[in-house]
Interface confidence: low
């Protein structure tokens, strides 16, 4: 089953809406939900059998300008005894996200959509075993 | 000092950056990076010790209009024998993403940004045990 990505190539037309004239839309600068204190639960990163850390990337010409990227702490997974089990693999779960890029860089009020593949956290998987013929 | 345009306060400009004209920015919706063949690896969802499925949400007034949300398959985690181990918990990793919301709904080329908390995949964690006093 094909899974749609978070960055479909063109803005879907709602019903019989005509196409956009110049590939640009106007976006209100208020951000809906911005004050809801929505935050990504961080406590899982240490309790997981595939723990991870966050690296913060900063880019003032991007919105959001600060993005946290996950990095798996081990190649294997942590077992019930707290030891690394190399028969399993810690892998990063990736999510395609949309960001806005100031264009041209500087104080322009024009942006363009940009796709980013973000490592969000890690999960423990069974490795794919390639059998010898 | 009266400013003729409602909602557009006059500004002393530092540098050469003009103020926003009408509380909106222009966004080019041609997505940079869209042809790089970026795709989210989906095979982890079944091989994980905390497997998950995807539910597709569709909203023609949102961009992207289709978003895949993860749902953990089990409350516990899958052990090496393929059995569910209820001493561990499958939990969803969440990521805050930006989407564009058509406003008002219809054919308008005006949008607003909206934050969404998206379940991206699942990871296996040690439960928090509350000790009896």
């Amino acid at each position: 089953r094909k899974n749609p990505k978070a960055g479909v190539p063109a803005l879907q037309k709602a019903g019989n809406c005509p196409p956009l004239e110049d590939n640009t839309v106007r976006v209100d600068i208020r951000i809906f939900n911005q004050n809801q204190g929505i935050s990504v639960p961080r406590e899982f990163q240490n309790r997981s059998s595939s723990p991870w850390d966050y690296n913060i990337t900063r880019d003032p010409h991007r919105f959001p300008s600060e993005i946290a990227e996950a990095q798996c702490r081990h190649s294997g997974c942590i077992n019930a005894q707290g030891q690394e089990d190399s028969t399993m693999n810690s892998v990063a779960i990736q999510q395609e996200i949309l960001v806005l890029r100031r264009e041209p860089q500087g104080c322009s009020n024009s942006f363009r959509l940009e796709k980013m593949l973000l490592k969000v956290g890690c999960t423990c998987v069974k490795p794919i075993v390639h059998q010898a013929a | 000092r009266k400013n003729p345009k409602a909602g557009v306060p006059a500004l002393q400009k530092a540098g050469n950056c003009p103020p926003l004209e009408d509380n909106t920015v222009r966004v080019d919706i041609r997505i940079f990076n869209q042809n790089q063949g970026i795709s989210v690896p989906r095979e982890f969802q079944n091989r994980s010790s905390s497997p998950w499925d995807y539910n597709i949400t569709r909203d023609p007034h949102r961009f992207p209009s289709e978003i895949a949300e993860a749902q953990c398959r089990h409350s516990g985690c899958i052990n090496a024998q393929g059995q569910e181990d209820s001493t561990m918990n499958s939990v969803a990793i969440q990521q805050e993403i930006l989407v564009l919301r058509r406003e008002p709904q219809g054919c308008s080329n005006s949008f607003r940004l909206e934050k969404m908390l998206l379940k991206v995949g699942c990871t296996c964690v040690k439960p928090i045990v509350h000790q009896a006093a």
């Epitope: 600068i29 | 009266k2 306060p9 530092a14 050469n16 950056c17 509380n23």
Partner: antibody, heavy 123, light 108 residues
């Protein structure tokens, strides 16, 4: 925790200077325009000054223009207000406030406030 | 400069009653009007923006209406924590953020 903490207030003589600071935490500072709003004892609110994400847009109330200077240091998550030639009528509680606009631009509504720092101008 | 006049200056009501606060602008501010709540010793809190949009986390008992020069903040049923001073603010003209003088809602 998302918060703004003001500092630098105090008792100062007329004609002297004072520099207020606002330390932001819990959010990405340069994603927001920032403002100073003041409140004289027992009185209402008065917007003083605002600055957008990259200091490209700056505004002042007529009552402080030419005397006060707003600035920000995004690397330090800090907002400042340099107040020169202070007058008795500048006596107030000074609040640091975050604009509710996105992209670091002005929307001119204030969605997050600090607790304020008191400035008293008296001889 | 646009002047915002709030009335009444003081509103004495009991918990459970409906509160209606008025804000009148000296010239049209279209729908660019916000309402803030301030409790003693605390910073203001945004309640309503652009005349009728509730800020995030604000209870449904608070609602705003109006456009042009006449605006109303309504608290459908007063809770004990709602007794405070309420300010309106316009963002339509220079200076970009002027406030009304405030309405104090006190317990009768």
């Amino acid at each position: 925790e998302v918060q703004l903490v003001e500092s630098g207030g105090g008792l100062v003589q007329p004609g002297r200077s004072l520099r207020l600071s606002c330390a932001a935490s819990g959010f990405t500072f340069d994603d927001y325009a920032m403002h100073w709003v003041r409140q004289a004892p027992g009185k209402g609110l008065e917007w003083v000054s605002g600055i957008n994400w990259n200091s490209g847009g700056i505004g002042y109330a007529d009552s402080v223009k030419g005397r006060f200077t707003i600035s920000r240091d995004n690397a330090k998550n800090s907002l400042y207000l340099q107040m020169n030639s202070l007058r008795a009528e500048d006596t107030a509680l000074y609040y640091c406030a975050r604009d509710m606009g996105g992209f670091g631009e002005f929307y001119w509504n204030f969605g997050l406030w600090g607790r304020g720092t008191l400035v008293t101008v008296s001889s | 400069e646009i002047v915002l006049t709030q009335s009444p200056a003081t509103l004495s009501l009991s918990p459970g009653e409906r509160a209606t606060l008025s804000c009148r602008a000296s010239q049209s501010v279209r729908s660019y009007l916000a309402w803030y709540q301030q409790k003693p010793g605390q910073a203001p809190r945004l309640l309503i923006y652009d005349a009728s949009n509730r800020a995030t986390g604000i209870p449904a008992r608070f609602s705003g209406s109006g456009s042009g020069t006449d605006f109303t903040l309504t608290i459908s049923s007063l809770e004990p924590e709602d007794f405070a001073v309420y300010y309106c603010q316009q963002r339509s003209n220079w200076p970009p953020a002027t406030f009304g003088g405030g309405t104090k809602v006190e317990i009768k």
